[in-house]
Interface confidence: medium
């Protein structure tokens, strides 16, 4: 496997008081293979609220690379292929659990972390505020 | 703490051969506060590809309950509020990490698992296959 420079301050994995710590097997089981999901590969281009994917990399995190969606337009694409600003493209956000090395560079010690990522975009009717 | 019936086959957390096992601090750190996220609260109703949330429960998994998006229509909602079948509502899927008790009923032994969840729906132009 990968050799990670070890931080001398790494916690003792046998320390019974290591806070709220459990043993986690990182041979990640992927439940998705049975369902044979059709990856939403080209939806980002075909959507009426298209998006671009941006790479976010952090070597101290697992997974190290996360792709983030950014909506291409404020409005949505209409039947003529033009942007209709009477509608809004908005990101669909989702929290994901990631593992962060803690302390940094410790090969066998992690903390679970929640981060918010934008997965894709959807087209919504705007909320119109009427001024009295 | 909680009294959990313990499986006698639980792995020894000090077993050096326990496969690819790491210590994980489950005090989940929330990185989302800095970005001040606005929850995409009502997008599921306001979207031109609206969706419902369905409950999926598994007591051996954390989080035990996952709410999955299911697109309400095959088509998308047009400006008149009707379903336009010339467009398609499709689910945006994302892999998330969950923890599974392994073996079951062991209080401090888990396996990371990747599952594919539908987060919401987007409206796409259909792929039309022309038959010669």
């Amino acid at each position: 496997g990968i050799t990670i420079p070890r931080n001398p301050g790494c916690p003792n994995s046998e320390d019974k008081n290591f806070p709220r710590t459990v043993m986690v097997n990182l041979n990640i089981h992927n439940r998705n293979t049975n369902t044979n999901p059709k990856r939403s590969s080209d939806y980002y281009n075909r959507s009426t609220s298209p998006w671009n994917l941006h790479r976010n990399e952090d070597p101290e995190r697992y997974p190290s690379v996360i792709w983030e969606a950014k909506c291409r337009h404020l409005g949505c694409i209409n039947a003529d292929g033009n942007v209709d600003y009477h509608m809004n493209s908005v990101p669909i956000q989702q929290e994901i659990l990631v593992l962060r090395r803690e302390p940094p560079h410790c090969p066998n010690s992690f903390r679970l972390e929640k981060i918010l990522v934008s997965v894709g975009c959807t087209c919504v009717t705007p909320i119109v505020h009427h001024v009295a | 703490g909680i009294t959990i019936p313990r499986n006698p086959g639980c792995p020894n957390s000090e077993d050096k051969n326990f496969p690819r096992t790491v210590m994980v601090n489950l005090n989940i750190h929330n990185r989302n506060t800095n970005t001040n996220p606005k929850r995409s609260s009502d997008y599921y109703n306001r979207s031109t590809s609206p969706w419902n949330l369905h409950r999926n429960e598994d007591p051996e998994r954390y989080p035990s309950v996952i709410w999955e998006a299911k697109c309400r229509h095959l088509g998308c909602i047009n400006a008149d509020g009707n379903v336009d079948y010339h467009m398609n509502s499709v689910p945006i899927q994302q892999e998330i990490l969950v923890l599974r008790r392994e073996p079951p009923h062991c209080p401090n032994s888990f396996r990371l698992e990747k599952i594919l969840v539908s987060v919401g729906c987007t409206c796409v132009t259909p792929i039309v296959h022309h038959v010669a």
């Epitope: 709220r20 459990v22 669909i92 956000q93 989702q94 929290e95 659990l97 929640k114 997965v119 | 703490g1 909680i2 959990i4 489950l26 989940i28 929330n30 989302n32 506060t33 800095n34 001040n36 996220p37 606005k38 929850r39 995409s40 609260s41 009502d42 599921y44 949330l53 429960e57 007591p59 954390y62 989080p63 035990s64 309950v65 996952i66 709410w67 998330i96 969950v98 209080p107 969840v117 987060v119 919401g120």
Partner: antibody, heavy 126, light 107 residues
């Protein structure tokens, strides 16, 4: 829907201990946590602590640290709150509340209290 | 700890009128704010979760808005059964805290 039924009213003397139970029914016990919230007469709500049933974790408000113990028994789907060293300031209604652990609308774990017990009135008086 | 301050402390409102209760957090809490209703001699009841999400079984006249530090609970068209005390609650960090409560009575 989850229902939480608490033990009955108690009258205690200063210095004594209190143990309140909260029996859950109508849902998988492991899929949520139980928090304890108290309300002194005419006052607002005060969170004391809680337990995450899936992991067996407990969290306590610093004010009650060392004096409160929250436990749960999965086999009987019952949570308990024990408070020691009672004083007259502990006179209150004690509530248990369900805290779901869910991945909902794109977010991990919801920490709202979506179901409450009926409350247990505790009077501490010499 | 995060302090939640509600205003007003008390409100007397006529039926069918609009009620607005605000909750201010001492620091940014994103949208981790929930609203509860407590009627006299009853347990609290969840009304709105995560600032603006409606809860099953709660009348649509109850709505919530806001994020960051400023939040609002609105009752559009007060009904007699809405009399009680309303609390906000933050769940972004421990210890969980509640606002001091806003008592609403019917004129």
């Amino acid at each position: 829907e989850v229902q939480l039924v608490q033990s009955g009213a108690e009258v205690k003397k200063p210095g004594e201990s209190l143990k309140v139970s909260c029996k859950a029914s109508g849902g998988r016990f492991r899929t949520y946590g139980i928090s304890w919230v108290r309300q002194a007469p005419g006052q607002g709500l005060e969170w004391m602590g809680g337990i995450t049933n899936f992991f067996g974790w407990t969290d306590y408000a610093q004010k009650f640290q060392g004096r409160v113990t929250i436990t749960a028994d999965e086999s009987t789907t019952t949570a308990y709150m024990e408070l020691s060293g009672l004083t007259s300031d502990d006179t209150a209604v004690y509530y248990c509340a369900r805290e779901p652990n869910e991945f909902w609308n794109g977010y991990y774990t919801t920490h709202d209290f979506d179901s409450w017990g009926q409350g247990t009135t505790v009077t501490v008086s010499s | 700890e995060i302090v939640l301050t509600q205003s007003p402390d008390f409100q007397s409102v006529a039926p069918k009128e609009k009620v607005t209760i605000t909750c201010r957090a001492s620091q940014n809490i994103g949208s981790e704010l929930h609203w509860y209703q407590q009627k006299p001699d009853q347990s609290p009841k969840l009304l709105i979760k995560y600032a603006s999400h409606s809860v099953s079984g709660v009348p649509s006249r109850f709505s919530g808005s806001g994020s960051g530090t400023d939040f609002t609970l609105t009752i559009n068209g007060l009904e007699a059964e809405d009399a009680g005390t309303y609390y906000c609650h933050q769940s972004i960090s421990l210890p969980y805290t509640f606002g001091q409560g806003t008592k609403v009575d019917i004129k």
